[in-house]
């Protein structure tokens, strides 16, 4: 029977008595930076080319005995998970291995850098099809390792890495913290985050998604026909590298941004039990388990968006936090969140020729997060329209006045320390979809975009008294681009998008007493692209 | 050890003619920074990645590495260039005493220096 991990990543349509999805990644080359490997193991023979690259530190300890099967264990297993004949994800993918980890599974940042440079030079000397680089390793945060990953990603290479096995914030480790890298956490057969001894999978905003990483059957270097079960975020990353290879084999022109968005889009949503994560990390950690797309083609018509959280601003009064989209993504909306509720909103602003999302802390606040909604919108022309505080009783409003521009997101930013004391709040008048409305003492920012066939609509859901959170979701075929709260009173902690749902969090005021005027509304902006839909129909 | 002594002598001879001091001092106001792993047991002091500014050519990287070796030799320190980076990031990997960091940070074209550290199979 099919191993649990392969079943988990396989859409029902492929589930027969065996795992045999179409096109096993045959157009893609996967580079593995790991230990030495037993390349003639029956599972992977002929699929892995061992390069002559080796850069490893000496093993620790004077009595260390170098046993070949132990030296090869980690890398052989991962090569099997990626492309093994019987237990691999992308059975058609060819691999190249570089040895950057010694027999104890230890390497150096410098050795890894030289390995990445070797891959770049190989790519320049002999350009092939799409490249995936699997980095099943982690060290402490490294500016230089992250920078090298960024350069390689900008050269068109897809990098996939382990989130780390330290039951900690992945942002404290490299290459897991590099934004350009696809960072993978580990889950088990029960969709629980993986526990490894006293530790376990890393988590947090630097994780892109999770994948099977416990009791994963794969090639064992103990003998040429042996299999063994291993666990860790390396195994999880190997699954995603395999899925990426298959996606790229089906659509070789996919960019890194497109691939990442597809990986997120086709993941199983909201299946992980978040109680395992520290409370302050739950909102930041994506509840996504990787899966293959149900069909290898035809996803192009969708408007893909993802949520990007910033680092925490820190508690100083003027502290700000910035969330950025990838180079070929569009920032379609910007929101903010503070656990204390003390914040001064958010705004979209240009930085280095690109829009970023900046959130502002307030006096006495413990800090804020900026939350960017980053989307793939070809031929888009987006701009931000701002209205300064109106000071009048009707509140501040701003709309998209340019012909053919639609509203994709609303942000509001205020200088006063506590909007909640400045009554009355105001609800947006209905029937004006291209308009953002906010508190009279806030400046309002509208994200207005023109793109072929783009249409958007506003959905609202309000409840009379805040009960912790209000949500509103976009229906099938529509994608959430904007998420904001009305009104911006002090008990609103912030708004953020989770997949296609807009979540507005507020303090539960049932203990302090509430009035009807303290109603909270979640406002979602849902968009779709008729142009992308038509283009995909013409292709089919 | 003999090898290293040999290298050291050769370097001193080869570079004695190079001007001392910091001829191409970094532009005013831009100071190179030093980074090291926050997790102490993972640090590998004595090996450093010197990262140069983005548009630095390979020849400039090599020249900067040689200049560091020459200035270190004049101060009685042995250094070894383990690798010169080009293709992804400009820079070089150097084995040297941490005492030389201040000197290295003042070299022309230097963006930042990072102490090497360990990575682990996950």
């Amino acid at each position: 029977s099919i191993p649990w991990n392969l079943e988990r990543i396989t859409p029902p349509r492929y589930r027969a008595d065996e795992y045999q999805p179409p096109d096993g990644g045959s157009l893609v080359e996967v580079y593995l930076l790991d230990t030495s490997i037993q390349s003639d193991h029956r599972e992977i023979e002929g699929r892995v080319m061992v390069t002559d690259f080796e850069n490893v530190p000496e093993e620790d300890g004077t009595r260390f005995h170098r046993q070949a099967s132990k030296c090869d264990s980690h890398g052989t297993h991962l090569a099997g998970v990626v492309s093994g004949r019987d237990a691999g994800v992308a059975k058609g993918a060819s691999m190249r291995s570089l040895r950057v980890l010694n027999c104890q599974g230890k390497g150096t940042v410098s050795g890894t850098l030289i390995g990445l440079e070797f891959i770049r030079k190989s790519q320049l000397v002999q350009p092939v099809g799409p490249l995936v680089v699997l980095l099943p390793l982690a060290g402490g945060y490294s500016r230089v390792l992250n920078a090298a990953c960024q350069r390689l990603a900008r050269a068109g290479v897809v990098l996939v890495t382990a989130a780390g096995n330290f039951r900690d914030d992945a942002c404290l480790y490299s290459p897991a913290s590099a934004p350009e890298v696809i960072t993978v956490g580990a889950t088990n057969a029960q969709d629980q985050p993986v526990t490894l001894g006293t530790l376990g999978t890393n988590f947090g905003r630097c994780v892109d998604l999770f994948a099977p990483g416990e009791d994963i059957i794969g090639a064992s270097s103990d003998c040429s026909t042996c299999f063994v079960s291993q666990s860790g975020t390396s195994q999880a990353a190997a699954h995603v590298a395999g899925i990426a290879a298959m996606m790229l084999s089906a659509e070789p022109e996919l960019t890194l941004a497109e691939l990442r968005q597809r990986l997120i889009h086709f993941s199983a949503k909201d299946v992980i039990n978040e109680a395992w994560f520290p409370e302050d990390q739950r909102v930041l950690t994506p509840n996504l388990v990787a899966a293959l797309p149900p069909s290898t083609h035809g996803a192009g018509w969708q408007l893909f968006c993802r949520t990007v959280w910033s680092a925490h601003s820190g508690p100083t009064r003027m502290a700000t936090a910035i969330a950025r989209c990838a180079p070929d993504e569009e920032l379609l909306s910007c929101s903010s969140f503070s656990r204390s509720g003390k914040r001064r909103g958010e705004r979209m602003e240009a930085q280095g020729g690109k829009l970023v999302c900046r959130a502002h802390n307030a006096f006495g606040g413990e800090g804020v997060y900026a939350i960017a909604r980053c989307c793939l919108l070809p031929q888009a022309n987006c701009s931000v329209h701002t209205a300064p505080p109106a000071e009048a009783s009707m509140g501040t409003r701003v709309h998209c006045h340019q012909q053919g521009h639609v509203l994709t997101g609303c942000s509001s930013h205020w200088e006063v320390e506590d909007l909640g004391t400045h009554k009355p709040p105001v609800l947006r008048p209905r029937g004006q979809p291209n308009q953002c409305v906010g508190h009279r003492e806030a400046s309002i920012h509208a994200s207005c975009c023109h793109a072929p066939g783009l249409e958007c609509k506003v959905k609202e859901h309000g409840i009379p008294a805040p009960q912790g959170q209000v949500t509103v979701a976009c229906e099938e075929g529509w994608t959430l681009t904007g998420c904001s709260a009305l009104p911006g009173t002090s008990h609103v902690l912030g708004a953020y998008a989770v997949d296609n749902t807009c979540v507005v969090r507020s303090r539960d005021v049932s203990t302090t007493g509430s009035t009807s005027e303290e109603a909270v509304t979640a406002v979602a902006i849902c968009c779709r692209s008729r142009h992308l839909a038509q283009a995909s129909q013409e292709l089919q | 050890q003999e090898d290293e002594d040999g290298d050291y002598e050769e370097l001193v001879l080869a570079l004695r003619s190079e001007e001392d001091g910091l001829a191409e001092a970094p532009e005013h106001g831009t100071t190179a920074t030093f980074h090291r792993c926050a997790k102490d047991p993972w640090r590998l002091p004595g090996t450093y990645v010197v990262v140069l500014k983005e548009e630095t050519h390979l020849s400039q990287s090599e020249r900067t590495a040689r200049r560091l070796q020459a200035q270190a030799a004049r101060r009685g320190y042995l250094t070894k260039i383990l690798h010169v980076f080009h293709g992804l990031l400009p820079g070089f990997l150097v084995k040297m005493s941490g005492d030389l960091l201040e000197l290295a940070l003042k070299l022309p074209h230097v963006d930042y220096i990072e102490e090497d550290s360990s990575v682990f199979a996950q």
Epitope: D40, R42, E45, K91 | -
Partner: antibody, heavy 115, light 109 residues
């Protein structure tokens, strides 16, 4: 191109030993092991075992375990198979083939065991 | 006694299609994706025609195709030609070794 070249035909007496060689070329040797297969006259194929060109590890078929030894000489890219205590039913064509997938075969070595 | 069962012979006329079966157990054919088919002409070494159930090596005619259902694998040759007359052997992984079928003699009438 990928090639496996075997040593020439042999005639052996029962009880003797046999050593057949197989020289590999045209591919990355460590990416594949070498399988040995024999075929008795007018019969089917019988898998005898496999040897790793990477680390010399072996995997023998139960039937021949103890009587067969496979070795490699990486310096010459040559794999050897020795069969001891030959019997008349060891008369066969012995083939080496690349890996477990056996996608490339040697030309075969005819071995006759007769008194 | 071979571990995998094949019909001793099959025949077909030029242009026709024939199928050769290869039956094993869940410990070999049914348990692995690695079923191969070999063609052997008299006095020649075997030649790989199909690997991993249904994949064709480069240079092998697309008239040859492979499939598997449960514990039985099949080789289909369409548009039979005179040069297809040969012995055909299937093979499969087992947990620790390899097994072959007894072989099928294909006669092109």
């Amino acid at each position: 191109q990928v090639q496996l070249v075997q040593s020439g035909a042999e005639v052996k007496k029962p009880g003797a030993s046999l050593k057949v060689s197989c020289k590999a070329s045209g591919y990355s040797l460590t990416s594949y092991g070498i399988s040995w297969v024999r075929q008795a006259p007018g019969q089917g194929l019988e898998w005898m075992g496999w040897i790793s060109a990477y680390n010399g590890n072996t995997n023998y078929a139960q039937k021949v375990q103890g009587r067969v030894t496979m070795t490699t000489d990486t310096s010459t890219s040559t794999v050897y198979m020795e069969v001891r205590s030959l019997r008349s039913d060891d008369t066969a064509v012995y083939y080496c083939a690349r890996g477990y997938g056996m996608d490339v075969w040697g030309q075969g070595t005819t071995v006759t065991v007769s008194s | 006694q071979s571990a995998l069962t094949q019909p001793a012979s099959v025949s077909g006329s030029p242009g026709q299609s024939i199928t050769i079966s290869c039956t094993g157990t869940s410990s070999d054919v049914g348990g692995y994706n690695s079923v191969s088919w070999y063609q052997q002409h008299p006095g020649k070494p075997p030649k790989l025609m199909i690997y991993e159930v249904s994949n064709r090596p480069s240079g092998v005619s697309n008239r040859f195709s492979g499939s598997k259902s449960g514990n039985t694998a099949s080789l289909t040759i369409s548009g039979l030609q005179a040069e297809d007359e040969a012995d055909y052997f299937c093979s499969s992984y087992t947990s620790t070794s390899m097994v072959f079928g007894g072989g099928t003699k294909l006669t092109v009438l």
